[in-house]
Interface confidence: medium
């Protein structure tokens, strides 16, 4: 999906007001300093992409973000204010709903969701140039 | 199939309150979403208000301590309490459940006018 057609500054402000304060809970009793942000991106567009990929794509060792809190505030705000998105994610979804798995945090989970506030505090802050 | 019933809407003058419903049927799975839209003439449908599974919700700034919506899950059905109404929250007003796969319902007018 190509997300250059998003309308940001809504998606900023759902961040700001929600989905932020999700990510801290998820993480919460791990130490800010725990993990490196490896994952970085350039601008809006490539940051959400990333973002997607983060948070909907399972990873070895990390199964389960799809059905936490951010993730379905995040796929809200995808659907919503990215033009077309909720109708490539039909398939997914549906998909994701029959292999409905038990929850669980693992340290692979805390580090990508780590990584996830990375990406969106580089979102939030477009004009910055990549370091 | 799920369907989605909005209601309540009407008019009323400056100042007045209104209180929308939307009424959720058929096969409903894991429902984590509810939302309100509007959509006035000539203009592209906004995002209003939304409330999570959690009990968390999202305010567009235009209707922030003017707007409250809430949810009773047992019932399947959304509502939006509209206080201090203004001529610009004439629109036709929308739900919509969950958003993987967006669903609408067929809206409500609600129309501010003295």
């Known amino acids: 999906y190509d997300f250059t057609n998003c309308d940001f500054e809504k998606i900023k402000a759902a961040y700001l007001s929600t989905i932020s304060k999700d990510l801290i809970t998820y993480m919460s009793g791990t130490k800010s300093t725990e993990f490196n942000n490896t994952v970085s991106c350039s601008n809006r567009p490539h940051c959400l992409t990333e973002i997607q990929s983060l948070t909907f794509n399972p990873t070895a060792g990390c199964a389960s973000l799809a059905k936490e809190m951010f993730a379905m505030k995040t796929k809200a705000a995808l659907a919503i204010w990215c033009p077309g998105y909720s109708e490539t994610q039909i398939n997914a979804t549906q998909a994701m709903k029959k292999r409905r798995k038990r929850k669980v945090t693992t340290n692979k989970c805390l580090e990508q969701v780590s990584q996830l506030q990375g990406l969106w505090r580089r979102f939030n802050r477009p004009l910055l140039k990549q370091q | 199939e799920v369907q989605l019933v909005e209601s309540g809407g009407g008019l009323v003058q400056p100042g007045g309150s209104l209180r929308l419903s939307c009424a959720a049927s058929?096969?409903?799975?894991?429902?984590?979403?509810m939302g309100w839209f509007r959509q006035a003439p000539g203009k592209e449908r906004e995002l209003v208000s939304a409330?999570?599974?959690?009990?968390?919700?999202y305010y567009a700034d235009s209707v922030k301590g003017r707007f409250t919506i809430s949810a009773d899950n047992s019932k399947n059905t959304a509502y939006l309490q509209m206080n201090s109404l203004k001529p610009e929250d004439t629109a036709v007003y929308y739900c919509?459940?969950?958003?993987?796969?967006?669903?609408w319902g067929q809206g409500t007018l609600v129309t501010v006018s003295s």
């Open positions: 919509a459940l969950d958003l993987s796969t967006v669903r």
């Open positions: 409330i999570f599974s959690d009990g968390s919700t």
């Open positions: 058929g096969r409903i799975f894991s429902t984590y979403f």
